[in-house]
Interface confidence: medium
């Protein structure tokens, strides 16, 4: 038995890419651990090295193969273990049935771009990345923009609930310097979560037109 | 050699549930290399993967969006045999239903079978 | 859900002949195809599993070949025992499906 809590979770990209992070209170000090992935019916299996995070936590990227090869599916199971060195044996200190299209987190959004800006609206286009064409259209989108003296926690949310990979922002104040993030998240999968956010995109709203209302 | 046994009624009434067991020999159902599976055969719907169940490290379940609300399939150690529940069923539910294994992805092993019709 | 169509849905043949059936898949699916043949009354039994391995005990005149989207599969010398019907099945996403079948025979 593990001592203290330990928590292991891990997401599939969907693509080529397992990310895990391993939590454990009282952990092992100056040990190496990793973790490995064995799929039930493929005939490969893959290592990464767990490197520290936090005080008590380690994270790993298991790299599956090429960055838009489908190596895993819906059928796949995955045996993931953290395993420890203790002395000259590996120890296994957690473990978990993986299936991957049930812990989906997709890339971040990559390639935002302004297409179109005037003086109260912008529209904004972007492209997912690694992302299975198993989702055809079943992804949903949360874009978020940052105005003026706000913080990004203060921004709402738009939630688009159809694989649009653009936004048409409305209302904007002329002349004012704005950011704008998204995130992408397939329908599937009971664990499945948000990708991280976009990088942001800074951009400009025209200035009014001199002598009209704005 | 490994055998899959099939038991259960031939006849089932509307809305009831449909029962059926498939018994192992030759090799376990909580192996780690392989799934145990229920598939059906209709004159309409042609062959239709139900759904399966199998132990890695703990037991899982998968299954066919189409039955998802009324499907149960469970595996019984102690007897080394795994069931298919089917609930609410319909005259389109008849067909004959199989066992089968999957080692190494593909259905190697089957049962011989039930004709199982839905009629009151 | 992965579409499986399978042609031609029969055909009739000579012992001795070349038989050669196709199977499509709506999305690639790798080289997961599995090849069954099934005689009336009888469960499906496993030819070819991963597009194109021999199962264990099948006789060398059946084989099987391709990847992606297109597969094909071929009795080099028809005989008398192989009328029935044939099935692809893709295994690399749930749910597992199956083509519509083939039915083979003898002339």
């Known amino acids: 038995a593990v001592n203290g809590t330990s928590q292991f979770t891990c997401f599939y990209n969907s693509r080529a890419n397992i990310s895990c992070v391993w939590s454990q209170d009282g952990a092992l000090q100056d040990t190496s651990c990793q973790v490995h992935a064995w799929p039930d019916r493929r005939r490969w299996n893959q290592t990464c090295e767990l490197l520290p995070v936090s005080q008590a936590s380690w994270a790993c990227n298991l790299i599956l193969g090429a960055p838009d090869s489908q190596k895993l599916t819906t059928v796949d199971i995955v045996t993931l273990r953290v395993l420890c060195r203790e002395g000259v044996r590996w120890r296994v200190m957690a473990i978990q049935d993986f299936k991957p299209f049930e812990n989906l987190r997709l890339m971040a959004p990559i390639s935002l771009q302004v297409v179109h800006v005037e003086t109260h609206r912008c529209n904004i286009s972007w492209e997912i990345s690694q992302a299975s064409h198993y989702f055809e259209r079943h992804l949903e989108f949360e874009a978020r923009t940052l105005s003026p003296g706000h913080t990004w926690e203060e921004a709402p949310l738009l939630t688009l609930k159809q694989k649009q990979e653009w936004i048409c922002l409305e209302t904007l104040t002329p002349d004012t310097q704005y950011e704008f993030q998204v995130r992408v998240k397939p329908l599937q999968g009971e664990f499945t979560t948000w990708s991280p956010w976009s990088q942001p995109l800074a951009f400009r709203t025209k200035p009014a037109a001199l002598g009209k209302d704005t | 050699q490994v055998q899959l046994q099939q038991s259960g009624p031939g006849l089932v009434k509307p809305s009831q549930t449909l029962s059926l067991t498939c018994a192992i020999s030759?090799?376990?159902?909580?192996?780690?290399?392989?799934?145990w599976n229920w598939i059906r055969q209709s004159p309409s719907r042609g062959l239709e993967w139900l759904g399966r169940t199998y132990y890695r490290s703990k037991w899982n379940h998968d299954y066919a969006e189409s039955v998802k609300s009324r499907i149960t399939i469970n595996p019984d150690t102690s007897k080394n045999q795994f069931s298919l529940q089917l609930n609410s069923v319909t005259p389109e539910d008849t067909a004959v239903y199989y066992c089968?294994?999957?080692?190494?992805?593909?259905?190697?092993?089957w049962g011989q079978g039930t004709m199982v019709t839905v009629s009151s | 859900d992965i579409q499986m169509t399978q042609s031609p849905p029969s055909l009739s043949a000579s012992v001795g002949d070349r038989v050669t059936i196709t199977c499509q898949a709506s999305q690639d699916i790798n080289n997961y195809l599995n090849w069954y043949h099934q005689k009336p009354g009888k469960a499906p039994e496993l030819l070819i599993y991963?597009?194109?391995q021999l199962e264990t005990g099948v006789p060398s005149r059946f084989s099987g070949s391709g990847s992606g989207t297109e597969f094909t599969f071929i009795i080099s010398s028809l005989q008398p025992e192989d009328t029935g019907t044939y099935y692809c099945?893709?295994?690399?996403?749930?749910?597992?499906?199956y083509g519509g079948g083939t039915k083979v025979e003898i002339k």
């Open positions: 089968a294994r999957d080692s190494k992805s593909a259905f190697d092993i």
């Open positions: 030759g090799d376990s159902v909580s192996g780690n290399s392989a799934t």
């Open positions: 099945q893709q295994y690399d996403w749930l749910p597992l499906s």
């Open positions: 991963d597009a194109s």
